[in-house]
C-alpha cells in the first residue's frame, strides 16, 4: 500500500539567464528509493539511481546539474524552460510516486518563489 507523500517546491518562478533548484521530498513511507527520474513535459532530464548515481540526458548536459540531494539544478534559464517538471520516485515495495513543479521563467527581475505544497 502506498502511504507516502511527495512534497515539492510547488509553483516557482525564476529570472531568464538565472538558475533554479527543483526539489522533491518523499515522506511518510519506509519504502526504499530505487531511482528518481526528473522529467520536463515527457522529456527525461536526469536520473538519480540508488546504485549508480546520476545520469544526465545528453541533450541537457550543458544546462542541468545534479543535486542538491535528489534535486536538480537548471541553469542558463530561457523562457522556453517555462512549464511542468515532474519528479518520479521509483520505490520498493510501494511503487511509483510522482510530484509536480510548475516553473515560470520571467524576463524581469521580479521572480518570486511560490509556497511549498503537498502532492499525495
Amino acid at each position: 500500500m502506498m502511504t507516502g507523500t511527495i512534497e515539492t517546491t510547488g509553483n516557482i518562478s525564476a529570472e531568464k539567464g538565472g538558475s533554479i533548484i527543483l526539489q522533491c521530498h518523499l515522506s511518510s513511507t519506509t519504502a526504499q528509493v530505487t531511482q528518481v527520474n526528473w522529467e520536463q513535459q515527457d522529456q527525461l532530464l536526469a536520473i538519480c539511481n540508488a546504485d549508480l548515481g546520476w545520469h544526465i540526458s545528453p541533450s541537457f548536459k550543458d544546462r542541468v546539474a545534479p543535486g542538491p540531494g535528489l534535486g536538480l539544478t537548471l541553469q542558463s534559464l530561457t523562457v522556453n524552460d517555462t512549464g511542468e517538471y515532474f519528479c518520479i520516485y521509483h520505490t520498493y515495495p510501494d511503487g511509483t510516486y510522482t510530484g509536480r513543479i510548475f516553473l515560470e521563467v520571467l524576463e524581469s527581475s521580479v521572480a518570486e518563489h511560490g509556497a511549498r505544497f503537498q502532492i499525495p
Partner: antibody, heavy 119, light 107 residues
Framework: EVQLVESGGGLVQPGGSLRLSCAAS????????MSWVRQAPGKGLEWVST????????YYADSVKGRFTISRDNSKNTLYLQMNSLRAEDTAVYYC????????????WGQGTLVTVSS | DIQMTQSPSSLSASVGDRVTITCRAS??????LSWYQQKPGKAPKLLIY???KSHTGVPSRFSGSGSGTDFTLTISSLQPEDFATYYC?????????FGQGTKLEIK
C-alpha cells in the same frame, strides 16, 4: 545490438534446485536494472524478480520469495536466478529482461529457457 | 496486488482493420502502463510505455492512450505480422502485474 541469452533450464524434481543464467551483450550491462519474468505453458506473463544495476537492491514476487535469489556479475555481463525448493507450479519459460534506463518498461527480452518441475 | 483485466480475451480481425484492445486496472496506476506483443514461441516485445510512448522502432500504426484505470492499445491498420498476443503491464506498484493477454487472430 542488444542480446540476452538465457541458459540453465531443464527438468528437475520437486524440491530440487536450478540456476539460470542470462548472458547480456550490446549495452552497458551494469547501468541497467534487470528482471526475470516467467510464463507457464499456455499462460500469461508473471514478474518474478528484479535487481538494480549495481546489484545492491533485489525484489521478489511473493510466490518465489525465500526460494529464489537473483544476482548479477557485472564483470561477466551475466544475470542469474538461483531457484531452490522448486515446485510443480514453477514450471515455465523463464525470460530475462532489460529495463529502460528510465525504469518505465522492459525494452529487451531474451528468448527464454524452459524449466520443468516434475517427478 | 493490482489486477489488470484485458478485453477482449481474443479477437478476430482482417488485414487493414482498425483494432482496439483495452486494459483496465483495479486501481489508479497513473500513466504507468506498458504494452507488449508476443508471438508463439517467441519473447515479448515492448510496443508502448508510459501509456502512450512508442518504443524505438515500433511502427506508427501502434498507439496507446489512457491514464488512471482505463487504457487502450490501437492498431490503426492491421498488417499480417501483427497477429499475436498482446499484454498490458502496470508499473505503478509491486508486484508488477500483467493482463491475461489478448489473442489477435486472422478472421
Amino acid at each position: 545490438e542488444v542480446q540476452l541469452v538465457e541458459s540453465g533450464g531443464g527438468l528437475v524434481q520437486p524440491g530440487g534446485s536450478l540456476r539460470l543464467s542470462c548472458a547480456a551483450s550490446g549495452f552497458t550491462f551494469s547501468s541497467y536494472i534487470m528482471s526475470w519474468v516467467r510464463q507457464a505453458p499456455g499462460k500469461g506473463l508473471e514478474w518474478v524478480s528484479t535487481i538494480s544495476g549495481g546489484g545492491t537492491n533485489t525484489y521478489y514476487a511473493d510466490s518465489v520469495k525465500g526460494r529464489f535469489t537473483i544476482s548479477r556479475d557485472n564483470s561477466k555481463n551475466t544475470l542469474y536466478l538461483q531457484m531452490n525448493s522448486l515446485r510443480a507450479e514453477d514450471t515455465a519459460v523463464y525470460y530475462c529482461a532489460k529495463w529502460l534506463l528510465s525504469y518505465y518498461a522492459m525494452d529487451y527480452w531474451g528468448q527464454g529457457t524452459l524449466v520443468t518441475v516434475s517427478s | 496486488d493490482i489486477q489488470m483485466t484485458q478485453s477482449p480475451s481474443s479477437l478476430s480481425a482482417s488485414v487493414g482493420d482498425r483494432v482496439t484492445i483495452t486494459c483496465r486496472a483495479s486501481q489508479n496506476i497513473n500513466v504507468w502502463l506498458s504494452w507488449y506483443q508476443q508471438k508463439p514461441g517467441k519473447a515479448p516485445k515492448l510496443l508502448i510505455y508510459k501509456a502512450s510512448k512508442s518504443h524505438t522502432g515500433v511502427p506508427s500504426r501502434f498507439s496507446g492512450s489512457g491514464s488512471g484505470t482505463d487504457f487502450t492499445l490501437t492498431i490503426s491498420s492491421l498488417q499480417p505480422e501483427d497477429f499475436a498476443t498482446y499484454y498490458c503491464q502496470q508499473g505503478q506498484s509491486y508486484p508488477y502485474t500483467f493482463g491475461q493477454g489478448t489473442k489477435l487472430e486472422i478472421k
